[in-house]
């Protein structure tokens, strides 16, 4: 039975040219996290494997930095970075937990962080 929940940074916004941290946190389960995948729509951005550490997709190697923790830092943001991001936690024995974050990249300097929320 999957008892865990994923808490994410929720809906967030940031300025063009700036950077943003995407964060997810898995709680309420004792399952072992074997790997976390970060995806943008269907594109794999990065992997954090419990044994092998961080691996960043070549498509994002100049703009993505691992961490903090299991999170991901996106740099040099462009308007094209607007969209859905998913943190996919592969765990044992529970299986897979997925969190969703919506990022809006703004032209102006009125970017504000959204509230945190939970996905069961």
């Amino acid at each position: 039975m999957m008892t865990g929940t994923i808490e994410t940074t929720g809906n967030i916004s940031a300025e063009k040219g700036g950077s943003i941290i995407l964060q997810c946190h898995l709680s309420s389960t004792t399952a072992q996290v074997t790997q976390v995948n970060w995806e943008q729509q269907d594109q794999l951005l990065a992997i954090c494997n419990a044994d092998l550490g961080w691996h960043i997709s070549p498509s994002f190697k100049d703009r993505v930095a691992p961490g903090p923790g299991l999170g991901l830092t996106l740099q040099s943001l462009t308007v094209n970075d607007t969209g859905e991001y998913f943190c996919i936690y592969h765990t044992y024995p529970d299986g897979t937990y997925t969190g969703r974050i919506f990022l809006e990249v703004l032209e102006s300097s009125v970017a504000e962080h959204g509230a945190r929320f939970q996905i069961p």
Epitope: Q43, L44, I47, N49, D51, L52, H55, I56, S57, P58, S59, K61
Partner: antibody, heavy 118, light 107 residues
Framework: EVQLVQSGAEVKKPGESLKISCKGS????????IGWVRQMPGKGLEWMGI????????RYSPSFQGQVTISADKSISTAYLQWSSLKASDTAMYYC???????????WGQGTLVTVSS | SYELTQPPSVSVAPGQTARITCSGD??????ASWYQQKPGQAPVLVIY???KRPSGIPERFSGSNSGNTATLTISGTQAEDEADYYC??????????FGGGTKLTVL
């Protein structure tokens, strides 16, 4: 110690089938990709395809798609490369190698020499 | 299909710097790796993810990758560095391709 041990040399006739193997040891077999690389006599390296034994996700080079099949049995930490109908042009040394995601192939098998001749 | 182009041969005097290039369309958007192969032996990884060096590989080996060109640099080349060198590119979907290879001769 990380090791990839490949099956022995094979001599086959055109039209015959073949399955060669690559057994991994000394590491978590399901955490790394296993790739297959062809080297024809006196020629360069050619990437054939790759498999992730953890979930059997497989990618092929367009040049080898439909010509060979890559598979893995994670219960015995072994990857396979097989042909249903060999051609003389399949004569080559075949290497298996492991890679962590986007990293390069950091450990290689010793190679399996396949000779196809009538 | 994607192709990588290397010079067939490069010569260098002992102690000098050897540079082997690898070119491909938007190669800088992929990860470049470099392999050394000596006669009768399996290849050995000398550079991965553009510029990282595996443990056990001497510091004289370095790599870079931007635009359409990846470069393997061997500083203070030694006789034992004489070998064939292959570049490889890996894209976001884990697909790879090798260059045609460069024979490095240490004069």
């Amino acid at each position: 110690e990380v090791q990839l041990v490949q099956s022995g040399a094979e001599v086959k006739k055109p039209g015959e089938s073949l399955k060669i193997s690559c057994k991994g040891s000394g590491y978590s077999f399901t955490s790394y990709w296993i790739g297959w690389v062809r080297q024809m006599p006196g020629k360069g390296l050619e990437w054939m395809g790759i498999i992730y034994p953890g979930d059997s996700d497989t990618r092929y080079s367009p040049s080898f798609q439909g010509q060979v099949t890559i598979s893995a049995d994670k219960s015995i930490s072994t990857a396979y490369l097989q042909w249903s109908s060999l051609k003389a042009s399949d004569t080559a040394m075949y290497y298996c190698a492991r890679a962590a995601w986007w990293q390069g192939f950091d450990h290689w098998g010793q190679g399996t020499l396949v000779t196809v001749s009538s | 299909s994607y192709e990588l182009t290397q010079p067939p041969s490069v010569s260098v005097a002992p102690g000098q710097t050897a540079r082997i290039t690898c070119s491909g369309d938007a190669l800088g958007d992929k990860y470049a790796s470099w392999y050394q192969q000596k006669p009768g032996q399996a290849p050995v990884l000398v550079i991965y993810e553009d510029s990282k060096r595996p443990s056990g590989i001497p510091e004289r080996f370095s790599g870079s990758n931007s635009g359409n060109t990846a470069t393997l640099t061997i500083s203070g080349t030694q006789a034992e560095d004489e070998a064939d060198y292959y570049c490889s590119a890996k894209d976001a979907s884990f697909n790879s391709v090798f260059g045609g290879g460069t024979k490095l001769t240490v004069l």
